[in-house]
Amino acid sequence: CDLPQTHSLSNRRTLMIMAQMGRISPFSCLKDRHDFGFPQEEFDGNQFQKAQAISVLHEMIQQTFNLFSTKDSSATWDETLLDKFYTELYQQLNDLEACMMQEVGVEDTPLMNVDSILTVRKYFQRITLYLTEKKYSPCAWEVVRAEIMRSFSLSANLQERLRRKE
């Protein structure tokens, strides 16, 4: 399965929506900056089978959706932009799920790189804990928005490779 061109477009739209979501100047939140340890090695894609890469991308997008669909998130971000954001994320999840089915068939569960899935989950755990420690402050959300934008940009490289890979 090759990811459709629309998937790359959706990823770009997601980045644009996240950029529009910014409400406060990042400069006013410099003191809240945090290194969440984005697991770059999981998105390099060299050591991956295609099915594993798709699983890792799916986990990242699903966790992003969950992160931004909490009550605390709804109270922070513009509702119209959030709805657009959800739509794009769902589009990407659907693309990846369609690919998964084609890669291995509906009934078959391939050997996933479970440690990669766990590594992505832990990355989002660090983000979640940061938000709870900061009591979901506007600056904390701004830092997280910037981090997720960065992670989507970095994962876009893997998505692009998947789109071209036979």
């Epitope: 699983s55 969950n66 669909s69 999840l93 569960t109 989950r121």
Partner: antibody
Framework: QVQLVQSGAEVKKPGASVKVSCKAS????????MHWVRQAPGQGLEWMGE????????IYAQKFQGRVTMTRDTSTSTVYMELSSLRSEDTAVYYC????????????WGQGTLVTVSS | EIVLTQSPATLSLSPGERATLSCSAG???????LYWYQQKPGQAPRLLIY???NLASGIPARFSGSGSGTDFTLTISSLEPEDFAVYYC?????????FGQGTKLEIK
């Protein structure tokens, strides 16, 4: 509010299979991994594995690999855990628990399903 | 597999006393992935503490957690009658996820 409702108690003979269901409500079913944890009478908790209802992929504990099958039905927001080749040591209460992150990790549990394996 | 060993197996105390429950990991566990659960007879476990020291929603402030590496502690500052139950530590730092064997807190 989040609710996980499990199927009723089962009595099975050694060598048979059992299929326990867990129906979820109060949240977007496909967004969270669902886990299965069991507890033998008077014993501690034991993690069996998890399923992502969105795409159906599973991760099983090595101990249960080959004997456990976790599936889901997105149309009814239900996950299933089937355990085959039952033996007396499989007599336990089986729980489903919803994944999540931070304060949401295993914050929601089903009420439990007692599976008794006896000849 | 990370083995979690809880001690003591049973702790007999009176209401108003302080309870200290230990959880020792066979190998290092990142504190972000160490959780505590309470279970009463006939009930499902209930989340008490997440990420070593954070109180779950609705849990009274008399409960607290601490620790790092391989040694973790759950403390109940002043026992209430409803606190007598079994307590489990749990890790999801690596597969397979594991639980301690439990500490039964009983009324003296």
């Amino acid at each position: 509010q989040v609710q996980l409702v499990q199927s009723g108690a089962e009595v099975k003979k050694p060598g048979a299979s059992v299929k326990v269901s867990c129906k979820a409500s109060g949240y977007t079913f496909t967004n969270y991994w669902m886990h299965w944890v069991r507890q033998a009478p008077g014993q501690g908790l034991e993690w069996m594995g998890e399923i992502n209802p969105s795409h159906g992929r599973t991760i099983y504990a090595q101990k249960f690999q080959g004997r456990v099958t976790m599936t889901r039905d997105t149309s009814t927001s239900t996950v299933y855990m089937e355990l085959s080749s039952l033996r007396s040591e499989d007599t336990a209460v089986y729980y489903c628990a919803r994944g999540g992150l931070g304060p949401a990790w295993f914050a929601y549990w089903g009420q439990g399903t007692l599976v008794t394996v006896s000849s | 597999e990370i083995v979690l060993t809880q001690s003591p197996a049973t702790l007999s105390l009176s209401p108003g006393e302080r309870a200290t429950l230990s959880c020792s990991a066979g190998s290092s566990v990142d504190s972000s992935y160490l959780y505590w659960y309470q279970q009463k007879p006939g009930q499902a476990p209930r989340l008490l503490i997440y990420s070593t020291s954070n109180l779950a929603s609705g849990i009274p402030a008399r409960f607290s957690g601490s620790g790092s590496g391989t040694d973790f502690t759950l403390t109940i500052s002043s026992l209430e009658p409803e606190d007598f139950a079994v307590y489990y530590c749990h890790q999801w730092s690596s597969y397979p996820f594991t639980f301690g064997q439990g500490t039964k807190l009983e009324i003296k």
